[in-house]
Interface confidence: low
């Protein structure tokens, strides 16, 4: 007869490991007992359990409560045992010794490998601002046994760099993602992907990129100069900009206070029926936590009685 076992048994941390040992004998042969021991190189054998055909399972004190027989039905030629709740320290070489009648004793070895799945963490880098050079967007760290793979999944252009630290029973891998911040990256996901043989599927942690910026400001509403005449209703100026964080708007008049009846509604300046009092230089001030911008326009309200052309001056300043 001969013993059937596995060269390597792989189990995830915390799971139960089945240590296989089956005697495939000739007709009429019987197994008297099966002894299991741990036999790591350089150390003496440490008994786990003894499985006796007549007296059942005896577990050594060091493994009390952790070694069991597989659930029924059981084959009398099967000397396999279950090692409950595998921990990293269980990783190593194991030997089963089978005493048979009348063929004698047989032994076989296997290696138990305990996978420690990583618990990845993602740390965003410093605040991203448009105009910065190559900047750390995020770093992702995962520690496990064996060493996990850490990669990035994103549509954003950037560069990655990885480093690994080996510990006695595991390895920590850190990957950094660097980019040159631009406003088009706002809201884009940057996903750290961690692969490991102990994971059923890749673990993914997503960081949403937020790049502070403020676009140049401009004012709309003066495109048709002839509309800005005395008595016109519904005239308005609209300040155009965009930013992250979303900006706030403020309107002032450069050559005095805003005329009475002029309505400020966020980015829009609404005028009552136009009079010559509404002529002047208006400034839209756009700001967010990152920056501020100004845009000024000159409004010249036409008097239809006079045949004078209206002049419009547009100036943008940062």
């Amino acid at each position: 007869g001969e013993l059937e076992t596995s060269d390597v048994v792989t189990v995830v941390l915390g799971q139960d490991a089945k240590l296989p040992c089956f005697y495939r004998g000739d007709s009429g042969e019987q197994v008297g007992q099966v002894a299991w021991a741990r036999v790591d190189a350089g150390e003496g054998a440490q008994e786990l359990a003894l499985l006796h055909s007549k007296y059942g399972l005896h577990v050594s004190p060091a493994y009390e409560g952790r070694v069991e027989q597989p659930p029924p039905p059981r084959n009398p030629l099967d000397g396999s045992v279950l090692l409950r709740n595998a921990v990293q320290a269980d990783e190593g070489e194991y030997e089963c010794r089978v005493s048979t009648f009348p063929a004698g004793s047989f032994q076989a070895r296997l290696r138990l490998r305990v996978l420690v799945p990583p618990l990845p963490s993602l740390n965003p880098g410093p605040a991203l601002e448009e105009g910065q050079g190559l900047t750390l967007a995020a770093s992702c760290t995962a520690e496990g046994s064996p060493a996990p793979s850490v990669t990035w999944d994103t549509e954003v252009k950037g560069t990655t760099s990885s480093r690994s630290f080996k510990h006695s029973r595991s390895a920590a891998v850190t990957s950094e993602f660097h980019l040159v911040p631009s406003r088009s990256m706002n809201g884009q996901p940057l996903t750290c992907v961690v692969s490991h043989p102990g994971l059923l599927q890749d673990q993914r942690i997503t960081h949403i990129l937020h790049v502070s910026f403020l676009a140049e400001a401009s004012v709309r509403g003066l495109e048709d100069q002839n509309l800005w005449h005395i008595g016109r209703e519904g005239a308005m100026l609209k300040c155009l900009s965009e930013g992250q964080p979303p900006p706030s708007y403020n309107w002032t008049r450069l050559d005095g206070p805003l005329p009475s009846g002029v309505r400020v509604d966020g980015d829009t300046l609404g005028f009552p029926p136009l009079t010559t009092e509404h002529s002047g230089i208006y400034v839209c001030h756009v700001s967010n936590e990152f920056s501020s911008r100004d845009s000024q326009v000159t409004v010249d309200v036409l008097d239809p009685q006079e045949d004078s052309g209206k002049q419009v001056d547009l100036v943008s300043a940062s």
Partner: antibody, heavy 117, light 106 residues
Framework: QVQLKESGPGLVQPSETLSLTCTVS????????VHWIRQSPGKGLEWLGV???????DYNAAFVSRVTISRDNSKSQVFFKLNSVQADDTAVYYC???????????WGQGTTVTVSS | DIQMTQSPSSLSASVGDRVTITCRAS??????LAWYQQKPGKAPKLLVY???NLADGVPSRFSGSGSGTDYTLTISSLQPEDFATYYC????????FGGGTKVEIK
């Protein structure tokens, strides 16, 4: 005009997989993100995940082990799978469109899914 | 995840009333907030994004304001078609929604 329409079985057995399809028209799924959101009386509106214009996916951490989102660009379809469903997965499931941000400018009409034996 | 707390959960109002709904985030969301309107049996409809920007086709009686953690949706003069449930939603990271505010006829 922009339209999204969800389809799939209205009844799913507990522990089975819920599979839904979102068919879109009026825009290209290679230019916009398509998200899945569900709504139930007990939990309100919950964002489940997204497949972005480039094909990458992101999932709500609470569902990451159970959700898979994929797509067929040629058919303008996005597919949603939720494994190991239980009674508390009973909800109206919506697909919705976004740009690069996570706000949703167009929604499907929703499809009611009941998990029951 | 960031939690969104919406108040009130319901309110009664009359046509022509000014209605204010508030939403508080558990941390700064930097104006990355949207508001939606939902009517029974229908999908939510985007009203406001980035806290203050009105979505296309939304009447000007709707407006959004706020910054940091506190945000407000205002309906300046309630119309019959405005009776619905309103939700806020942040998009600063994994999106989450508020619990909703049901606006009912008084």
């Amino acid at each position: 005009q922009v339209q999204l329409k969800e389809s799939g079985p209205g009844l799913v057995q507990p522990s089975e997989t819920l599979s839904l399809t979102c068919t879109v028209s009026g825009f290209s799924i290679t230019n916009y993100g398509v998200h899945w959101i569900r709504q139930s009386p007990g939990k309100g509106l919950e964002w489940l995940g997204v497949i972005w214009s480039g094909g990458s996916t992101d999932y709500n951490a609470a569902f990451v082990s159970r959700v898979t989102i994929s797509r067929d660009n040629s058919k303008s379809q996005v597919f949603f799978k939720l494994n190991s469903v239980q009674a508390d997965d009973t909800a109206v499931y919506y697909c919705a469109r976004s740009g690069k941000w996570y706000y949703f400018d167009y929604w499907g009409q929703g499809t009611t899914v009941t998990v029951s034996s | 995840d960031i939690q969104m707390t919406q108040s009130p959960s319901s309110l009664s109002a009359s046509v022509g009333d000014r209605v204010t709904i508030t939403c508080r985030a558990s941390e700064n969301i930097y104006s990355n907030l949207a508001w939606y309107q939902q009517k029974p049996g229908k999908a939510p409809k985007l009203l406001v994004y980035a806290a203050t920007n009105l979505a296309d086709g939304v009447p000007s009686r709707f407006s959004g304001s706020g910054s940091g953690t506190d945000y407000t949706l205002t309906i300046s003069s309630l119309q019959p078609e405005d009776f619905a449930t309103y939700y806020c939603q942040h998009f600063w990271g994994t999106p989450t929604f508020g619990g909703g505010t049901k606006v009912e006829i008084k």
